[in-house]
Interface confidence: medium
């Protein structure tokens, strides 16, 4: 296999991503990565239900700030809702913070697919009413 070098701890591993550590800053059963806490949901919910569930946990539905975070999250759970959506196929993709999402979202040409999920090292559109695992994120 190829070699992955992690500069964070100067070690070489034959895995594709960093190990998520359980640190004191995050609630129990949440994981820490790069100054954020992540709740890894075990149950499947629609996009709107997932949004609400995260709000009730004083956090937000999974947002992905950069490509390295995406690589990390994909390795944990390759199919999960993200906080990226659009009002319709005629509207741009935006984040739950109201920012335009500028990266590629696969299958965007499907007019019924208006919510985005993490999928195979990227984002893919799907029906907002379909049930998926959800993750929540809270920045430290």
């Amino acid at each position: 296999p190829s070699t992955l070098t992690q500069k964070h701890n100067n070690s070489s591993l034959n895995t594709r991503t960093q190990k998520a550590c359980h640190c004191g800053h995050c609630p129990e059963e949440w994981i820490t990565y790069s100054n954020s806490c992540y709740y890894i949901g075990k149950e499947k919910r629609t996009w709107a239900e997932s949004l609400l569930a995260c709000t009730l946990k004083n956090s937000s539905l999974l947002s992905i700030d950069n490509e390295e975070e995406m690589k990390f999250l994909t390795a944990i759970s390759p199919s999960t809702w993200t906080g990226v959506f659009r009002d319709s196929s005629q509207h741009p993709w935006v984040t739950i913070n109201g920012l335009t999402f500028k990266h590629e979202i696969k299958d965007s040409d499907n007019a019924e697919h208006n919510c985005a999920m993490l999928h195979a090292r990227g984002l893919k559109s799907d029906r907002c009413g379909s049930s998926k695992i959800y993750h929540c994120k809270h920045k430290l």
């Epitope: 992955l4 992690q6 500069k7 950069n66 590629e104 090292r121 990227g122």
Partner: antibody, heavy 118, light 107 residues
């Protein structure tokens, strides 16, 4: 317009070293993983190495592990490949290629030829 | 490492023909497969990603299908500019690997 321009290729003796560069423009370089891919004359494509956007994740093919080092300078929008202990079988056109989030190589440079011969 | 085997290695066809190239992975790679076109002296060009998604700007006569281990690139009606070498690539896991290529020639 996205542009990737490789440089630094040339003729080098077996056991020698060479440093390739890839100058990027037309996109936010610091948001993308970058890769080196090579192609020996008349042969197919071979992935060589990858580096994530902030250099946290670095990957190598077994054929170059321990000899090649990938790096990047986001301030200079540049990707590098330091090649040491070069062998005849490293002779190839070397391409740099950009990764979009979760996508394969959507943009490639024009390539730079490395020839390892005595 | 995951090995990709393309078939055929070379293919002769005429303008207007329907052409199919296959790519088989040595182990399952979900839908994480791309197809590239390369012309002599030029860099490869991405055609298809995620097994079946057409890259923006690529003509609709190109299509991809498959998942798991068996994948197909189809050109529905060959045009003169389509004669080139085609490569599949898996991006499911490192090391990333390419198929050996399929050379598409004019009959």
């Amino acid at each position: 317009e996205v542009q990737l321009v490789e440089s630094g290729g040339g003729l080098v003796k077996p056991g020698g070293s060479l440093r390739l560069s890839c100058a990027a423009s037309g996109f936010t370089f610091s948001s993308h993983s970058m890769n080196w891919v090579r192609q020996a004359p008349g042969k197919g494509l071979e992935w060589v190495s990858a580096i994530s956007s902030s250099s946290s994740y670095i990957y190598y093919a077994d054929s170059v592990k321990g000899r090649f080092t990938i790096s990047r300078d986001n301030a200079k929008n540049s990707l590098y490949l330091q090649m040491n202990s070069l062998r005849a079988e490293d002779t190839a056109v070397y391409y740099c290629a950009r990764e979009e989030w979760g996508l394969p190589f959507d943009y490639w440079g024009q390539g730079t030829l490395v020839t390892v011969s005595s | 490492a995951i090995q990709l085997t393309q078939s055929p290695s070379s293919l002769s066809a005429s303008v207007g023909d329907r052409v199919t190239i296959t790519c088989r992975a040595s182990q399952g790679i979900q839908s994480a497969l791309a197809w590239y076109q390369q012309k002599p002296g030029k860099a490869p060009k991405l055609l298809i990603y995620d097994a079946s998604s057409l890259k923006s700007g690529v003509p609709s006569r190109f299509s991809g299908s498959g998942s798991g281990t068996d994948f197909t690139l189809t050109i529905s009606s060959l045009q003169p500019e389509d004669f080139a070498t085609y490569y599949c690539q898996q991006f499911n896991s490192y090391p990333l690997t390419f198929g050996q290529g399929t050379r598409l020639e004019i009959k």
